[in-house]
């Protein structure tokens, strides 16, 4: 069986301040079992934007029903974008365990924030 891939089709997305940004992510397999997390940036300083498993992420909504067992679309929408949201966002697949372990990351989508039109 082919190994799961995390696909982020958009290399970059540009959004005006105050608008919502849609960041696309799909996986190619249901295996291994485990949650998706979204991060801004890479490495130890990365910021957790969304955790499918736990937490409250008020500005983030999932584009599809990510809780459905057969779901493979983990795209998100981030509302009310500000300049501090600019950066590269990574969709990351985790393998279920105690604790969950990082399995594979998407290539990233760079979000740039334009000034709000006056």
């Amino acid at each position: 069986e082919e190994e799961l891939q995390v696909i982020q089709p958009d290399k970059s997305v540009s959004v005006a301040a105050g608008e919502s940004a849609i960041l696309h992510c799909t996986v190619t397999s249901l295996i291994p079992v485990g949650p998706i997390q979204w991060f801004r940036g890479a490495g130890p300083a990365r910021e957790l934007i969304y955790n499918q498993k736990e937490g409250h992420f008020p500005r983030v909504t999932t584009v599809s029903e990510s809780t459905k067992r057969e779901n493979m679309d983990f795209s998100i929408s981030i509302s009310n974008i500000t300049p501090a949201d600019a950066g590269t966002y990574y969709c990351v697949k985790f393998r279920k365990g105690s604790p969950d372990t990082e399995f594979k990351s998407g290539a990233g989508t760079e979000l740039s924030v334009r000034a709000k039109p006056s």
């Epitope: 105050g18 910021e47 500000t82 501090a84 949201d85």
Partner: antibody
């Protein structure tokens, strides 16, 4: 219910060190950035430091950079502030504050820990 | 760096009257402004976020308005328990997170 409880405050001399702790409960601690904010006697609120959810990203106010270190233990649901080379102007009540989301305001505050730096 | 200026420094209002507090930013902060209440000897408490949204459990006599650089916190009918210092906080540009200097609301 979200609870943040600071400890470790006290009286120290200039140049000495102190470590503050903040025990968190009632929310998924490892999912949220956390902050320290201080308030000198009779003064307003001053942001001190921030740490991201995983603990690998930190930011500091210029006034404490190089002297203070923020850290966290997600397995123990605890936030720390290591304060070295303390000065009289560091005298304040130190509050730990939870961030609403990674780029957001502070939605819950602890009760505070008093740090007094005096010779 | 964004500077937040609150006015007036002190506001004295009779019970039942309206209190209007101002917070002005040195550059736009969009709608990314929060208001915190701090009663004497207590920790701050979140009142309003994203300029207009009341936090959980906050009475509806508290309301926020504004966007860009000018913001207002209104207490429609002041109660004695509203005696406190009120701080605005911006989170549009960071670090650092910035607070205003505070407005002290006193009961006449």
């Amino acid at each position: 219910d979200v609870q943040l409880v600071e400890s470790g405050g006290g009286v120290v001399r200039p140049g000495e060190s102190l470590r503050l702790s903040c025990a968190a409960s009632g929310f998924s601690f490892s999912s949220y950035a956390m902050n320290w904010v201080r308030q000198a006697p009779g003064e307003g609120l001053e942001w001190v430091s921030r740490i991201n959810s995983g603990g690998g990203g930190t930011d500091y106010a210029e006034s404490v950079k190089g002297r203070f270190t923020i850290s966290r233990d997600n397995s123990e649901n605890t936030l720390y502030l290591q304060m070295n080379s303390l000065r009289a102007e560091d005298t304040a009540v130190y509050y730990c504050a939870k961030q609403y989301d990674w780029n957001g305001f502070f939605d819950y505050w602890g009760l505070g820990a008093l740090v007094t730096v005096s010779s | 760096e964004t500077v937040l200026t609150q006015s007036p420094a002190t506001l004295s209002v009779s019970p039942g009257e309206r209190a209007t507090l101002s917070c002005r930013a040195s550059q736009t902060v969009g709608s990314k402004l929060a208001w915190h209440q701090q009663k004497p000897g207590q920790a701050p408490r979140l009142l309003i976020y994203d300029a207009t949204n009341r936090a959980t459990g906050i009475p509806d006599r508290f309301s926020g308005s504004g966007s860009g650089t000018d913001f207002t916190l209104t207490i429609s009918s002041l109660q004695t328990e509203d005696s406190a210092v009120y701080y605005c906080q911006q989170y549009y540009y960071w670090p650092p997170y910035r607070f205003g200097g505070g407005t002290k609301v006193e009961i006449k």
